[in-house]
């Protein structure tokens, strides 16, 4: 059993405020921000993260650069506005009334526009492409173990059914991690590939979301791997739509 | 479904030796910070020891060198051989598995650990 039942706490997620107030005394919790209950046994979504994030601002984080073959999470920080079941709307707006649409991670995927600006649907985020860059190490990492122990990682960690991690790509120091997961292919109760790298960006940060005070502790083959660059793209099953001026600034 | 059951415990005699168990499915022991805690009556749950997922082991400072704490990949058993047990060891033993690749922090606490077995009780008579 876990430490929920004993302590009324969230094992998956430390931005939330639980008490025993659920049916027949269970524990219940509840994310910041948003008030909305989450399932502890699993990953809460990124859109319900980031409003519990923004109702507990802390430094800025520094952005990624851009990538003229996929999305990457330029814009940075927003407080966003979730769908009853934690996903991002498709449109976003800030207070100055200034919007924009996403994909299903929560990133920018049209120009900013006014209020008028519509979004018919949420675009899937089909393919992340996380790659990082790791330490210095005695030598190279053994490929089939690293490949092994990232795909442990993200089963046992994050609860990704395995289907999902496509490939691990490494040369030293360079390590791929893709995850692919096709709105077809995701059923319900599993874990959207778009959480499980929300969570993970935020491990290799130092910035669990997991209750305990421990981290991330990863390592190949007793060798902790330690991250010193992560960059993460987003590639949708519609295309982005950037005017020109934009690709060309 | 990650499960802990815990065995071994018992009666023994002051001086005495003990062997706890704790078998572990759902969940790889070797990648993340497992423990044992104990809990007397009417005291609180306090850290006995913790195994890293590197192989290193931490003892609270009343069992240092009278307690270890090893796990088995292969079996993906962790145990907790006693030794010289007191009067004082009497308790309910848990044991306890953080989030999976999760680290040991000092002090432990019990806040860090999301799995728990049932418990095992063991006794030290004088």
């Known amino acids: 059993h876990t430490a929920a039942q004993d302590n009324c706490t969230c094992p998956t997620n430390k931005m939330t405020v639980c008490s025993p107030d659920g049916p027949g005394g269970r524990c219940q919790c509840r994310a910041l921000g948003s008030g909305m209950a989450v399932d502890c046994s699993t990953l809460t979504s990124k859109c319900l993260l980031l409003k519990a994030r923004m109702s507990a601002p802390k430094n800025a984080r520094t952005l990624v650069r851009p990538s003229e073959h996929a999305l990457v999470d330029n814009d940075g920080l927003y407080d966003p506005d979730c769908d009853p079941e934690g996903r991002f709307k498709a449109r976003q707006c800030n207070q100055t009334s200034v919007c924009w649409c996403v994909n299903s991670v929560g990133v920018r995927r049209t120009d900013k526009g006014d209020l008028s600006l519509r979004c018919d649907e949420l675009v899937r985020t089909h393919h992340i492409l996380i790659d990082l860059r790791h330490r210095p190490t005695a030598g190279a990492f053994n490929h089939s173990d690293l490949d092994a122990e990232l795909r442990r990682l993200f089963r046992e960690r994050y609860r990704l059914h395995p289907k999902f991690v496509a490939a691990v790509h490494y040369e030293q120091p360079t390590i791929q991690i893709e995850l692919r997961q096709n709105t077809s292919q995701k059923a319900a109760g599993d874990v959207d590939i778009g959480d499980a790298a929300y969570y993970f960006e935020r491990d290799i940060k130092g910035e669990s979301l997991f209750q305990g005070r421990g981290g991330l502790d990863l390592r190949v083959r007793g060798e902790p791997l330690q991250v010193e660059r992560t960059l993460i793209y987003y590639l949708d099953e519609i295309p982005p739509k950037f005017s020109m001026k934009r690709l060309t600034a | 479904q990650v499960q802990l059951q815990e065995s071994g415990g018992g009666s023994v005699q002051a001086g005495g030796s003990l062997r706890l168990s704790c078998a572990v499915s759902?969940?790889?022991?070797?990648?993340?910070?497992m423990g044992w805690f104990r809990q007397a009556p009417g005291k609180e749950r306090e850290g006995v020891a913790v195994i890293r997922s590197s192989g290193e082991t931490t003892a609270a400072d009343s069992v240092k060198g009278r307690f270890t704490i090893s796990r088995d990949n292969a079996k993906n058993t962790l145990s907790l051989q006693m030794t010289s047990l007191k009067p004082e060891d009497t308790a309910m033993y848990y044991c306890?598995?953080?989030?999976?690749?999760?680290?040991?922090?000092?002090?432990?606490?019990?806040?860090?650990?999301?799995?728990w077995g049932q418990g095992t009780q063991v006794t030290v008579s004088s």
């Open positions: 306890a598995a953080a989030w999976p690749y999760s680290g040991c922090l000092l002090p432990l606490s019990s806040g860090d650990f999301t799995y």
């Open positions: 759902g969940l790889t022991s070797s990648t993340t910070c």
